[in-house]
Every structure is written in C-alpha cells, then in structure tokens.
C-alpha cells in the first residue's frame, strides 16, 4: 500500500469539528496541526471520534508536550484520557479541583482503572494532604475510594475532611484502617451533642476502643447489632453485661442471633453465666458460677 | 463486553429502501456512541453515520437519504435507508464504543446488494 503521508487537498483541519470524524486515521495523522487541537481541546469531548482516532489525537499531543500535557489540556480531555496510560499521567501536574472532576466525569458509574487510580494519586500527592473538597469529590465518585487508602495514607487526612465521610464510604474498611480515622472522627464531632454525636461517628465505631464504648453505653445511644457486630473484639471483651445491655437498648434482644459469632461468641466466654442469664436471652457459654476468672495478661504485664 | 448482531440486509432495486436493524446486548449501560459502516469490495471499511447522545451525524453520500436511530428501550440501533443507489451496495457493520473500557465492538455485518 502506498504510504499516505501528505494531506489531501481541501482536507486541511481550520478548527477541531465533527467533519473530522469522516476522516481516515492517516488524514488525521495528516491533516490536523497538534497545535489547534491543543487550543481547541475542549471541542474534541463533543465529536463521536472513535477510540482509533482519538489515539491519533493523542499521538499528536504526544509530540507537542513530551515532557507532559498542561493542565489546560488535560482539563478538556473528556474521552481521551481513557487513551491515557499511568505512565502519561504520571508526568502531569494536577493541581485544580475542576480538572480531576472533569476527568473522574469520564467514567463515571465504572470501577476506579489504573488511570483514574494514578491521577488521583498525583493530585493527592501535589496537594499534599486529603483535604475536605477533595474527598467530597473522590467519595463521590468512587464511594470506596477511602478505603483503598492504607492506614499510613489515611494519616495525612485532616480531621475536618472528615465531615465529609458518608457510612457507605466506610462499607470496605478493615480494622486497621478504622482505628487510623475513628480518632479523626473523634475531634472532628467532639464538640456535638449526645445524639447528633452518635448518628455522626457511629460508622467509625469499627475503630472505638473500650474507654469510648462504656462511655457511650452511659448514653442511651440504643447501638443497632450491625454496629456491634463491626466493633474491635478486643474493645468488646471487657464491656460488661450491663454495659452492653445499655449500649444496645431495645437490640440487646439480637445477641441471641449473633450468640455464634464473633466479637458476640468471644464476649459471652468473657461473662459470668449468672449476668448473662439476667438479659433473658437464653445466652449460654458463660463462665459457670462459681469459677474464679484470672487475668493472665494482667499477671504478665506486673511480672 | 457488549454483543451486536445485526439483520435487515437484502437485495433491494435502485429507489427502493431498506431498514438495517442492530441489536446490542450485554453492558450497553457503557455504551458511548454506536454507528454504521460499510465496505464495498476491494475498499476500505467506511463511516456511514453515527449516534451520539442525542445527536446524528452523516457522510455526505448518504446525508438527506439515510436516517440512523436507536431505541433506548429495545437495546437497538437503526438505518433506515431511502432512494437507494447501486453504489450503496457493501457489506454494512454495526459499531459500538464503551465508556470504562474504552474499546470497539463490532457485528458480523449484513449484505446489501442495490441492483440497476
């Protein structure tokens, strides 16, 4: 096949339109200067170009920025920054809050790809800390976004980004990264009411430890069994039976379901028969009456 | 991975029309724009028209006699071709990208032989 290099008469692109999706992926090669398509980058969001062409089209601005786009460019890239590999992105600057949203626009309603993963990495990285409109932004999108941080990336987020965690943001969390942003929720809601406080940091419970819970078992919060079954086991071990009958309220009745599972099963073990058998629940494996309980750990730590 | 199949080809006199038919399925919820193409023997495979959102776009051969649709509902995309011409005689493909993946997919494509 000849090779088809030059331009065809009458062919030359004036401006970035939808004529252009006619063209061959050679004439685009040929015909569109890399120059116009940077200026007139917002444009290119508009026209169906396939995924060939827009290839073409980022061959181009390839050329023209070797050292990486600018952030005008990368703004209006819509579409094509799925054409986008890490490695492109990782030369970028991204510093404004528009352009990431512009750019997690483009899959919306898709997993988080190793592109949008890399973009949002550079531009956390660039601000330097996980602010408040940054996680808005990122939770909005990706609802588990959070939670694929490790516990030493959830350091760096400030207390008051907190505020704007919803619970399902938190569904995919594990302990170690519950107890990292249970302290930040702590003091983001310190200065709440009772109730209001409890709603508010009742999805950070996961990372609570036992000084927090007896407290709040002193404020009629009636936890719900979903709650207590996420709690840290060894934070539920030394509530008491009164304790954890005032926590849950109304749901003390769920142990009865959960009296298998865990930190239920664990902390039955923990408690005289006699006082689990004051909930009237039928729960059994309690330490028969009688029975004197050592605290071997306790004996280690004064040894 | 999104599945298309297209029907409705045949032959047909010059003047008469034809309405080619492409049924999609699997993740169409990703689906960014679906368009119709067509290859004449010995050429290259060429862009008839295009949907994207709510609109159309056509090459000049075909504008003001082809007509391209889709129906949301049934998953399906149209071309409705009018006042056909010898010359529109070609192996027609329906084509679709995705958002997220960011790929192609194409059908086995119909014949549509326009005689004089």
């Known amino acids: 096949e000849v090779e088809k290099t030059a331009c065809p008469s009458g062919k030359k692109a004036r401006e970035i339109d939808e004529s252009l999706i006619f063209y061959k992926k050679w004439e685009l090669e040929a015909c569109v200067d890399a120059a116009l398509l940077a200026t007139q980058m917002d444009r290119v969001n508009a026209i169906p170009f396939t995924y060939e062409q827009l290839d073409v089209l980022k061959h181009k601005l390839d050329e023209l920025y070797p050292q990486g786009y600018p952030e005008s460019v990368i703004q209006h890239l819509g579409y094509l920054f799925l054409k986008m590999s890490p490695e492109d992105i990782r030369k970028w600057n991204v510093t404004s809050l528009e352009t990431l949203k512009a750019l997690l626009e483009v899959n919306k309603g898709h997993e988080m790809s190793p592109q949008v993963a890399t973009l949002i990495d550079r531009f956390v990285k660039g601000r330097g800390q996980l602010d408040k409109d940054t996680l808005d932004t990122l939770t909005a999108f990706y609802p588990g976004y959070l939670c694929s941080l490790s516990p030493e990336e959830l350091s760096s987020v400030p207390p008051s980004s907190i505020w704007a965690v919803r619970p399902q943001d938190l569904d995919t969390c594990d302990p170690r990264q519950l107890d990292v942003l249970y302290p930040k929720a702590r003091l983001a809601f310190q200065n709440m009411n009772g109730s209001e406080y409890f709603v508010k940091i009742q999805s950070f419970l996961g990372g609570a430890p036992t000084e927090d819970l007896k407290a709040l078992s002193q404020q009629n919060v009636s936890m719900d069994l979903a709650t207590f079954m996420k709690l840290r086991t060894d934070a539920v071990l030394p509530l008491t039976v009164a304790e954890v009958q005032k926590l849950l309220g109304p749901h003390v009745e769920g142990l009865k379901a959960e009296e298998r599972h865990r930190p239920v099963r664990d902390w039955i073990l923990r408690q005289r028969q006699d006082d689990l058998d004051t909930l009237g629940l039928g729960l059994q494996g309690g330490i028969p009456n009688g029975y004197l309980v050592l605290d071997l750990s306790m004996q280690e730590a004064l040894s | 991975q999104v599945q298309l199949v297209e029907s409705g080809g045949g032959l047909v006199q010059a003047g008469g029309s034809l309405t080619l038919s492409c049924a999609a399925s699997?993740?169409?919820?990703?689906?960014?724009?679906m368009r119709w193409y067509r290859q004449a023997p010995g050429t290259e495979r060429d862009l008839v028209a295009v949907i994207y959102g709510s609109s159309t776009y056509y090459a000049d051969a075909v504008k003001g006699r082809f007509t391209i649709s889709r129906d949301n509902a049934k998953n399906t995309l149209y071309l409705q071709m009018n006042n056909l011409k010898p010359e529109d005689t070609a192996v027609y493909y329906c084509?679709?990208?995705?958002?997220?993946?960011?790929?192609?997919?194409w059908g086995q494509g119909t014949q549509v032989t326009v005689s004089s």
């Open positions: 699997g993740s169409t919820f990703s689906i960014r724009a």
């Open positions: 084509n679709a990208d995705t958002i997220g993946t960011a790929r192609d997919y």
